[in-house]
Structures are given as structure tokens and as C-alpha cells.
């Protein structure tokens, strides 16, 4: 079943996705689509990224976090009701049906009326897995898609592994609630 | 220590092309992307595209689409820039500056860039 | 293509002075954003990526911020080896784009 994020009508809706880049410069693309996983690919695109940009995009879809380094968390600009339903992010890994997919579901929130301190994240729930890929050998392929053979190690929680992490020192920084 | 030295400069005439090499040291070459940046005289920085050469994978700005084409040679740790179809417009200074990976890609080094003078 | 929005173009300072400008870009680039300066005749050089690291060797007297669409670089103190053309540039998004340039002169 899917996580369960939520946000406030008004403010930004931060869906996290993570993976952890074989080796500099080979980034795994990832996309993300508004609706479930899909067989293939992403329906209904928002954001895609490929071997090292962001080369597609919808207005209110953004990556804030360090998407090179792994971080292809969603961020959703001034989230509207109409926001609410399941978001799919695709790590595209190279190989038939290697792709690890992730469906987040987004619940907004009419405003509240009594002012509130701003929060710019509101999570609630688990973090979805992290990815570790690990390359075996280099990529000498003469296409940018082309990447290394990635054995993936699922990992239930980010929590512990987000201890020491910079993301733990953003989201504390942020001043995030993780329920 | 790393350093990019760019071949010398370049006169050509409208419609011939222009190769430009930049040979890379102090550094693992297939590592790191290769981008290219001009400048025409007086102006700002404008992007061509990058190529990472542990792949020969390219990315081109559109506006240069068709006319740049950019490629590697791993045994001497050298990056080429090719522009055809020269114009005057293509006046300018010509760098190729690392990507790199610890720093986002933004570019932590650059050649010391090569003139190309486009005149009839 | 995003456009970076760079101001002022011209900045007359003088020794001891702090400075700032800024950069604005058409949509949210996160903080993928760099800042490089350029002296005549020489190859730009990298002083902040990523909005707000500096890079090896810079000065603390430069500093970066902004995240998403505004952005702002800052010397502290200006000195005289710090007269020069910088630029600020996004690489969000291919095609990468920089700012026009702001030139720091003397006053």
C-alpha cells in the first residue's frame, strides 16, 4: 500500500524519493507521474530527469534537494485540493523490468483558519526505501542512457540511515515534522 | 594539479568550421563532464553542451543543434569542439571548463580559452 | 530556457564596502546555482556552487544564499583584487544559462 503524505492547501507538498548514484556522473533517470506505477515508464509526467539534468518539467514541480547526489524528493508549489491522489517516482534502472518504483500517496488539506507557524514539509508516516546501486565496471557505451549493470539492496527505512546525513541536518534545518 | 589547456586561436571565413581541442591533466579524464562555454567580445557566457567522456555521451543547447558537435579522446585525456557553418556572430572565445560532480557541475576549472574570429 | 535575471549590471564600491546582488531565475532551479568571477582577459573562476558552498581556496568574505528562484551573492568587504565581472549561472536545466554579469568599479 501506498505511504501517505500530506500538505495544507497553500503550501508546498514534499513527496521523498531517494537512490544512491552507482558512481559520479551516472545518474540513474527517474521520472514522476501523477496516478499509480504504470508497467513502464510514468503516466501522466510531471518531472523527469536524466543522466544529469532535470530535462522536463511542469509548472509547481520542482527537485529542491540534491538530485545529483540521489535526492529526486518532489517538491509540489502551492498545492491546491486538486493535488490530492498517488504519485509514482521511477528509478529508470538500466535492464528489462529493474526499474524500482515507488507510489506516494498525497493527501491535501483545506487550510486551516487559525494562523499556524509556516511549515514548509509536513510528513507523515514511514520515508519510503532507499536505493543503494552499486556499479560493476565502467559504462564505455556510446550513448548517454547507457549506464553499468546495478545490483540494487532495498532498505526498509531512511531513518537510520539518514543519522549523520546531510538530509537529516535539512530536514531538521527545515524544521520539518517527521511523524 | 588539474589544468585544461585549449588549442590557439582561430581565423576562418563565414560557412567554414572551426575544431577546437582542450587537453586535460592532473585529473582522472573520464570522471568528469567536458562543457563548452563562448563569449563573444564585450558579452556574457553562453552554453554549447557538455560531452562525459567515460561514455562519449553528449548533450547540445539546441540554439547549436546541427552545427556543434562535440567528442573525446580518452588515450591523450583530450576534448574536442567542432562549430560548423561559422557566421560572424560566432566571434567569440571559446572554453571548455569541467563539470563536476562535487561541485553539482558547476565548473570548477577552466581553459584559458581560444579566440575564433569569424571574418569574410 | 531559463532565464537568469541578473542585477545591477554596473556596482561602484569602494574599499571596505559591502556589496550584494542578485540573481533571479524564470522558474525554481532549487539551489542549483553557481557564481564565478571573471577578470579581463582571464577564464571565468568558481567562487560558490550549489547557492551557498564555497569553493576551495575562496575567501570567506564571499557568500552565497537563495534557493528556488532568488539568489544573492555578497562580499563583505570589498578589496581592490576584487574588481571584476561576476556571473551568476544556473545548471538546473540544460541548456545551462548565466546571468548578464554585474562589474564591480571603483566608485
Known amino acids: 500500500s501506498e505511504v501517505e503524505y500530506r500538505a495544507e492547501v497553500g503550501q508546498n507538498a514534499y513527496l521523498p524519493c531517494f537512490y544512491t548514484p552507482a558512481a559520479p556522473g551516472n545518474l540513474v533517470p527517474v521520472c514522476w507521474g501523477k496516478g499509480a506505477c504504470p508497467v513502464f515508464e510514468c503516466g501522466n509526467v510531471v518531472l523527469r530527469t536524466d543522466e544529469r539534468d532535470v530535462n522536463y518539467w511542469t509548472s509547481r514541480y520542482w527537485l529542491n534537494g540534491d538530485f545529483r547526489k540521489g535526492d529526486v524528493s518532489l517538491t509540489i508549489e502551492n498545492v491546491t485540493l486538486a493535488d490530492s491522489g498517488i504519485y509514482c517516482c521511477r528509478i529508470q534502472i538500466p535492464g528489462i523490468m529493474n526499474d524500482e518504483k515507488f507510489n506516494l500517496k498525497l493527501v491535501i488539506k483545506p487550510a486551516k483558519v487559525t494562523p499556524a507557524p509556516t511549515r514548509q514539509r509536513d510528513f507523515t508516516a514511514a520515508f519510503p526505501r532507499m536505493l543503494t546501486t552499486r556499479g560493476h565496471g565502467p559504462a564505455e557505451t556510446q550513448t548517454l542512457g547507457s549506464l553499468p549493470d546495478i545490483n540494487l539492496t532495498q532498505i526498509s527505512t531512511l531513518a537510520n540511515e539518514l543519522r549523520d546525513s546531510r538530509l537529516a541536518n535539512d530536514l531538521r534545518d527545515s524544521g520539518a515534522t517527521i511523524r | 594539479q588539474v589544468q585544461l589547456v585549449q588549442s590557439g586561436a582561430e581565423v576562418k571565413k563565414p560557412g567554414a568550421s572551426v575544431k577546437v581541442s582542450c587537453k586535460a591533466s592532473?585529473?582522472?579524464?573520464?570522471?568528469?563532464?567536458m562543457d563548452w562555454v563562448r563569449q563573444a567580445p564585450g558579452q556574457g557566457l553562453e552554453w554549447l553542451g557538455y560531452?562525459?567522456?567515460?561514455?562519449?555521451?553528449?548533450s547540445y543547447n539546441q540554439k547549436f543543434k546541427g552545427r556543434v558537435t562535440m567528442t573525446t579522446d580518452k588515450s591523450t585525456s583530450t576534448a574536442y569542439m567542432e562549430l560548423r557553418s561559422l557566421r560572424s556572430d560566432d566571434t567569440a572565445v571559446y572554453y571548455c571548463?569541467?563539470?563536476?560532480?562535487?561541485?553539482?557541475?558547476?565548473?570548477?576549472?577552466w581553459g584559458q580559452g581560444t579566440t575564433v574570429t569569424v571574418s569574410s | 530556457s531559463i532565464v537568469m535575471t541578473q542585477t545591477p549590471k554596473f556596482l561602484p564600491v569602494s574599499a571596505g564596502d559591502r556589496v550584494t546582488m542578485t540573481c533571479k531565475a524564470s522558474?525554481?532551479?532549487?539551489?542549483?546555482v553557481a557564481w564565478y568571477q571573471q577578470k579581463p582577459g582571464q577564464s571565468p573562476k568558481l567562487l560558490i556552487y550549489?547557492?551557498?558552498n564555497r569553493y576551495t581556496g575562496v575567501p570567506d568574505r564571499f557568500t552565497g544564499s537563495g534557493s528556488g528562484t532568488d539568489f544573492t551573492f555578497t562580499i563583505s568587504s570589498v578589496q581592490v583584487e576584487d574588481l571584476a565581472v561576476y556571473f551568476c549561472?544556473?545548471?538546473?536545466?540544460?541548456?545551462?544559462?548565466f546571468g548578464t554579469g554585474t562589474k564591480l568599479e571603483i566608485k
Open positions: 571548463a569541467r563539470g563536476g560532480y562535487y561541485s553539482y557541475y558547476s565548473y570548477d576549472y
Open positions: 592532473g585529473y582522472t579524464f573520464t570522471d568528469y563532464y
Open positions: 560531452i562525459y567522456p567515460n561514455n562519449g555521451g553528449t
Open positions: 522558474q525554481s532551479v532549487g539551489n542549483n
Open positions: 550549489y547557492a551557498s
Open positions: 549561472q544556473q545548471h538546473y536545466s540544460s541548456p545551462y544559462t
